[in-house]
């Protein structure tokens, strides 16, 4: 029998302890939120907020400008000064809760935990390829706001998510805030609201539409807003909240809330429970039917998918998919599965399920006992009745009221449990060629860039490397600028190439040449590298014979 070279075990063909140095910026405090801007004339910026300060960085992470956003009441606070002579309320530190781009102007909007959660608008002033912030505008009109009616009170100290949508000649802010009794009593931020930014940037228009957790539920029923995004005709919020109003706080689960992006109304507000599970190939005795539930969403991102994953998900290439990282939750008993699982929810399917749920509620034959739900926002009722009514009213439409869809959307872990003990804390998904890549940050300060494929029993790594020695968790906010992603960990912001930081972690020529084409890896004498790192021969087609 002919002798063959011994096979190198797969795990031995790569080394994830290889050190990669990626550009970074020290922000001088824990990074609270971050967003990037790419203009149409090659100007770009990274905006980074820490307590009491907002940094403007170039795409190379060099500092361009810095602005004092607090403490409120401090004479050095530059944003506070935009609101005119004070006092404007209790003094204290400003934690930035919202940092979003208003793309139509363009401008940056920041909202903090101080000064009743008001926002500031910073026009973007391009200077060559750099971007500066103009003097801030205070989006707050003192005489328009009262504790019980405050259109300009946007951010909650407990957390707020905002998505900005351009409709006609106006910008609408879709706002979702976590509340408790104390926050609700103080200048009344709302749970979910749609607010129009006034054209003169004096604040937000009055009489905005909103939903809020009812006062009687505020103590026990808290909603965490994990992510928000706009795609197609809708804005979506992702929440973690008690599964039951009556048993709250109790067990948690994850919901998707859908709002119209074309009409600033909340009558067609819909919620759907998202169910993510780990279903091992071989089910252990005593393991739950249908797989082990992972009910708590940690992070999420929506992106169009490449051809390979699209085929596996039975959808068309380029369709938008919501990816979520889920964990088991505190009360789920001793876990035998992975720490984190990743589920994929195609947006079109989500929309179809929601629309079918509306039909079930509103079209005859009426399903007896079907609840409208959302009892934490509105009076309990059965379909097709409006909230709080025992019977349908002739001049109200069943469809014009918020609804919790009666079915849930169930998916299983894309990685088949292969993330193991890894605790994912950040997620950003990109499409590269026909491949879909999940860029994940972890609780121990690492970046994992992994090809998303359903059918494999191993992880297809683009990279797996440590951002530094601090080992601090990578934060939820991830932003993209060109071919780079920006991750934050502790007080640092890191710039990570989408195609991976390098190829040196591939140890064998065979493994090197099997790397995805977009990574640009080739064999370079005795190591795997990119062409520009290679002074000698660089080979992407075949390996030298092993002697």
């Amino acid at each position: 029998k002919e002798w063959q070279c011994p096979r190198t075990p797969y795990a031995a063909s790569r080394d994830f302890n290889v050190k990669y140095m990626v550009p970074s910026f020290s922000a001088g405090g824990l990074v609270q939120t971050m967003v990037t801007y790419q203009g149409d004339k090659n100007e770009s910026a990274v905006f980074v907020a820490i307590r009491n300060r907002l940094h403007v960085l170039g795409p190379d992470l060099k500092s361009v400008q810095s602005l004092a956003t607090g403490p409120a009441g401090d004479p050095g606070c530059q944003t506070c000064a935009a609101c005119g002579p004070g006092p404007h309320g209790p003094s204290g530190d400003t934690d930035t809760k919202v940092l979003v781009l208003e793309p139509a102007l363009p401008a940056l909007v920041s909202c903090g935990s101080s000064l009743q959660g008001r926002c500031f608008l910073h026009d973007l002033d391009p200077q060559g390829t750099a971007v500066h912030l103009a003097a801030p505008a205070c989006l707050f009109s003192a005489h328009h706001n009262r504790p019980d009616d405050c259109p300009d009170c946007v951010a909650s100290p407990l957390g707020t998510r905002v998505t900005v949508v351009e409709q006609g000649q106006a910008s609408y802010f879709y706002v979702a805030s976590s509340l408790d009794a104390a926050v609700a009593a103080s200048f009344s931020p709302r749970s979910v609201s749609i607010r129009r930014l006034k054209a003169d940037a004096s604040g937000f228009a009055p009489g905005f539409v909103a939903l809020s957790v009812l006062p009687k539920h505020l103590v026990s029923y808290s909603i965490e807003y994990v992510h928000s995004f706009h795609t197609g005709a809708f804005v979506y919020f992702l929440t973690v909240q008690p599964a039951s109003v009556t048993d709250a706080p109790g067990a948690l689960h994850t919901r998707l809330a859908r709002l119209s992006a074309t009409e600033p109304e909340l009558g067609d507000y819909r919620e759907l429970v998202l169910d993510c599970r780990f279903a091992p190939k071989r089910r252990r005795r005593g393991a739950p039917e249908g797989g082990q539930p992972y009910p708590v969403l940690r992070v999420a991102h929506s992106a169009p998918v490449g051809a390979q994953l699209a085929t596996e998900l039975s959808i068309a290439e380029g369709q938008e998919v919501l990816f979520g990282v889920f964990v088991a939750g505190k009360d789920s008993g001793p876990g035998v599965g992975p720490n984190s699982v990743v589920c994929a929810f195609p947006i079109d399917l989500l929309d179809t399920l929601i629309d079918e749920g509306v039909e079930r509620c509103c079209e005859s034959p009426v399903h007896p006992g079907l609840r409208r739900g959302l009892d934490f926002f509105q009076s309990p009722s059965f379909c097709p009745n409006p909230p709080g009514l025992e019977a349908p009213s002739p001049n109200t439409s069943c469809r014009h009221f918020p609804l919790l869809v009666s079915s849930s959307f169930s998916r299983v872990d894309l990685f088949n449990g292969l993330l193991g003990t890894v605790e994912v804390t950040a997620l950003y998904v990109t499409r590269l060629d026909n491949v879909t890549v999940a860029h994940m940050g972890t609780a121990d300060g690492r970046i994992l860039q992994v090809e998303l494929a359903r059918s494999l029993n191993y992880l297809l790594y683009v990279s797996n490397f440590s951002l530094g020695d601090s080992g601090q968790p990578v934060q939820r906010d991830v932003s993209r600028l060109g071919d780079h992603l920006f991750f934050a960990s502790g007080d640092q912001v890191f710039q990570v190439p989408i195609q991976g930081p390098g190829c040196r972690h591939f140890l064998t020529c065979g493994r090197c040449l099997r790397a995805q084409r977009f990574m640009g890896c080739g064999w370079c004498g005795n190591m795997c590298g990119r062409q520009k790192e290679c002074p000698g021969s660089w080979q992407q087609d075949h390996c030298p014979p092993k002697l």
Partner: antibody
Framework: EVQLQQSGPELEKPGASVKISCKAS????????MNWVKQSNGESLEWIGD????????RYNQKFKGKATLTVDKSSSTAYMQLKSLTSEDSAVYYC?????????WGQGTLVTVSA | DIQMTQSPASLSASVGETVTITCRAS??????LAWYQKKQGKSPQLLVY???TSVEGVPSRFSGSGSGIQFSLKINSLQPEDFGSYYC???????????FGGGTKLEIK
């Protein structure tokens, strides 16, 4: 559909006052400021001022302070502009225009003629 | 107050030609600029806002550009219905009241 319907033409004597109206429909009247703009014959457009129908707050171009007074009637979704101490300089077409990034919605204009 | 200087005050062009109207602000107004078309006896029509955002339903031959203090409106391949007056407008933004440029009368050659 957003519509702004203005009152008809006015012929006034010098020294008199005139009040023109702008009735809004197709949107939430109190949610948007109402602007007023003047165009004299063959001249450019001039912004007179605006009013916030929800709170009643007004802002004026310095040139029109004391000349124009802006008010609203929320119950009828109507904005008004009164011009006082009329002179021939006030002869012009006056437009109402809804707040926005740029004024996308205009009334059809009201011609005010001041003549002895 | 911000002054808006529009040029030229008038121009004549033929159908099919391309024309450019410019507007200069006396100070930085970022992208807070709108353009209108005004015909005799009609209300102004918004063409462009935020310096370069075209209004839905406005023909694509109208395009705005610029930021800061210098702005322009370009009309490609002039059509007979494009003749009239054009105005730039410093949009309302914090602390700055709206101001119109002096206008450009576009006539048929």
């Amino acid at each position: 559909e957003v519509q702004l319907q203005q009152s008809g033409p006015e012929l006034e004597k010098p020294g008199a006052s005139v009040k023109i109206s702008c009735k809004a429909s197709g949107y939430s009247f109190t949610g948007y400021n109402m602007n007023w703009v003047k165009q004299s014959n063959g001249e450019s457009l001039e912004w007179i001022g605006d009013i916030d129908p929800y709170y009643g707050g007004t802002r004026y171009n310095q040139k029109f302070k004391g000349k124009a007074t802006l008010t609203v009637d929320k119950s009828s979704s109507t904005a008004y502009m009164q011009l006082k101490s009329l002179t021939s300089e006030d002869s012009a077409v006056y437009y109402c225009a809804r707040e926005g990034r740029g004024f996308a919605y205009w009334g059809q204009g009201t011609l005010v003629t001041v003549s002895a | 107050d911000i002054q808006m200087t529009q040029s030229p005050a008038s121009l004549s062009a033929s159908v099919g030609e391309t024309v450019t109207i410019t507007c200069r602000a006396s100070e930085n107004i970022y992208s807070y600029l709108a353009w209108y078309q005004k015909k005799q006896g009609k209300s102004p029509q918004l063409l462009v806002y935020n310096a370069k955002t075209s209004v839905e339903g406005v023909p694509s031959r109208f395009s705005g550009s610029g930021s800061g203090i210098q702005f322009s409106l370009k009309i490609n391949s002039l059509q007979p219905e494009d003749f009239g007056s054009y105005y730039c407008h410093c949009q309302h933004h914090y602390g700055t009241l709206p101001t119109f440029g002096g206008g450009t009368k576009l006539e048929i050659k």
